[in-house]
């Protein structure tokens, strides 16, 4: 006959308050007679959970029917968990005797402990945009999970990011706990319609990792570029001229033309396109009256973007009979 | 349905010999400890002998070294071999099955009559 | 050997009647007490074992209790085919051993 082995599988059990709690427990011989208790803790004070052989215990259940002469599991529900049941419980046979049943082997014990799923991250990027070329810090938040043991990961559309600092606090024992993480991201001109995720998993979450996200739209300034043209057809005594302002992001900008210095409110009419990489384009006719025109007309366009110090492009008014020759310089 | 049925009894003279059965229906009999018990007319219970399902044997004082108890897996059946048989052995013998897990007997044959007379 | 003695050897009681057997141990058996009901002609049938638990298809009225050496049967309201012959047994340790019986008679 072989020797009786009591098999408790699980080393660490994570519930849930108000939840039931399964301790598996198999043996692997029905020798000698006698019944299977569980017990939490060890020692003298342990406390009896369960006993096969007799008592009433009102939130424990089998698993399968002790009355079956083949049955070899002895695993037991616990309905209504709470937080004073978190222990160790171990699965004990004892062998029939008198004046009390002797213990024979026990399990190696199953701990069970609170487990508490993580709050869903929170994301956070910089207060200021930021323009490519440049990094930026996001920080990921989750609280209230249990146990401490935690992963977290970066990732930049699809891509994982290496360079991030973790703390989960607090350092020592304690009901629940909270995790900071801090990634430093480059931005990229194409960035526009990127996203910064963070994932993290935890054994309460059962292998599907919460994620927090977070649009680098949100942290993001493109500058624009500036140029500016003059058509080369006349209508009439009038030149159209074309500021195109492009490649910028966010969206808020403000154009104005001016003439030899003075600012013009006559912008005949503009557009703005979005690109595939979510910046913008923005273009500005400008008519100008050549009826009565001096040779040396000096047209500007200036930006103003999200706020940023204004940029200009200047052009020098060729005003001939076939207007072909046009120059420009640009001032900052 | 769980049954367990007796047979082999009869009359044998004071030294003879008998091999009482039983045959076990609706559950496998080498998984239980299996019991014989027996009860002379008008008196009490007594047990006779047992077999653990290790192959282990125990035997009551009185029929220690006459009496032989057995199983065979294959035919589902507990047995009794009863040799140097006394007057005092006249009695119903029963088959009776031991508990899941504690040996308290649970299922019980309907008996078989063994007479010691000369 | 553990010696059981039941106690009394008789007893008369009417339909209704409550009656209570018990049945000493001459050493200590834990809880490794049945009980059995055996009524003329027929095998004896399992009513208790472990001192208190009611085996598959015994009614409630039947109960058992009892630790270590004393142990008692209670039959809460007597019905007519409950008037039989019980038996306790030890079944703590080889060679088992039952009491000799109780007789219960209608009055």
């Known amino acids: 006959e072989e020797e009786l082995q009591m098999i408790q599988p699980e080393k660490l059990l994570l519930v849930t308050v108000g939840k039931t709690a399964t301790l598996h427990c198999t043996v692997t011989s029905l020798l000698p007679v006698g019944p299977v208790l569980w017990f939490r803790g060890v020692g003298p004070g342990r406390e009896l959970i369960y006993n096969q052989k007799e008592g009433h215990f009102p939130r424990v259940t089998t698993v399968s029917d002790l009355t079956k002469r083949n049955n070899m599991d002895f695993s037991i529900r616990i309905s209504s968990i709470t937080p004073a049941d978190v222990g160790t419980y171990y699965c004990v046979k004892f062998r029939k005797g008198s004046p009390e049943d002797v213990e024979f082997k026990s399990g190696p014990g199953t701990e069970m402990a609170l487990g508490a799923k993580p709050s869903a991250p929170v994301v956070l990027g910089p207060a200021a945009r930021t323009t490519p070329e440049h990094t930026v810090s996001f920080t990921c938040e989750s609280h209230g999970f249990s146990p401490r043991d935690i992963t977290l990961k970066w990732f930049k559309n699809g891509n994982e990011l290496s360079d991030f600092q973790t703390n989960v606090d607090p350092t020592g024992q304690s009901v629940a706990y909270s995790i900071r993480s801090t990634a430093r991201v480059v931005l990229d001109p194409w960035d526009v319609r990127s996203q910064v995720i963070c994932e993290v998993a935890h054994v309460t979450l059962q292998g599907d990792p919460l994620r927090g996200t977070a649009n680098l739209s949100e942290a993001i300034r493109v500058p624009p570029t500036l140029e500016v043209t003059q058509q080369p057809m006349r209508v009439g005594n009038q030149v159209n001229v074309t500021c195109q302002v492009r490649k910028f992001y966010p969206q808020s900008l403000q154009l104005t033309w001016s003439e030899n210095g003075n600012v013009c409110q006559r912008e005949t009419a503009s557009t703005l396109t979005e690109n595939k990489d979510g910046t913008y384009n923005w273009t500005s006719w400008f008519l100008v009256n050549i009826s009565d025109q001096r040779d040396d007309v000096v047209l500007t366009c200036q930006v103003k973007h999200d706020g940023q110090l204004a940029v200009s492009k200047r052009l020098a008014l060729e005003v001939t009979v076939h207007q072909k020759d046009q120059s420009s310089d640009a001032t900052p | 349905e769980v049954q367990l049925v007796e047979s082999g009894g009869g009359l044998v003279q004071p030294g003879g010999s008998l091999r009482l059965s039983c045959a076990a229906s609706?559950?496998?009999?080498?998984?239980?400890?299996m019991h014989w018990v027996r009860q002379a007319t008008g008196k009490g219970l007594e047990w006779v002998s047992a077999?653990?399902?290790?192959?282990?044997?125990y035997y009551t004082g009185s029929v220690k070294g006459r009496f032989t108890i057995s199983r065979e897996n294959a035919k589902n059946s507990l047995y009794l071999q009863m040799n140097s048989l006394r007057a005092g052995d006249t009695a119903v013998y029963y088959c009776?099955?031991?508990?899941?897990?504690?040996?308290?007997?649970?299922?019980w044959g309907q008996g078989t009559m063994v007479t010691v007379s000369s | 050997d553990i010696q059981m003695t039941q106690s009394p050897s008789s007893l008369s009681a009417s339909v209704g009647d409550r009656v209570t057997i018990t049945c000493r141990a001459s050493q200590d058996i834990n809880n490794y007490l049945a009980w059995f009901q055996q009524k003329p002609g027929k095998a004896p049938k399992s009513l208790i074992y472990t001192a208190s638990s009611l085996h598959s298809g015994v009614p409630s009225k039947f109960s058992g209790s009892g630790s270590g050496t004393d142990f008692t049967l209670t039959i809460s309201s007597l019905q007519p085919e409950d008037f039989a012959t019980y038996y306790c047994?030890?079944?703590?340790?080889?060679?088992?051993?039952f009491g000799q019986g109780t007789k219960l008679e209608i009055k």
């Open positions: 009776v099955r031991g508990g899941v897990w504690d040996d308290a007997f649970d299922i």
């Open positions: 609706g559950f496998t009999l080498s998984s239980y400890d």
């Open positions: 047994q030890q079944y703590v340790s080889y060679p088992y051993t």
């Open positions: 077999i653990g399902t290790a192959g282990d044997t």
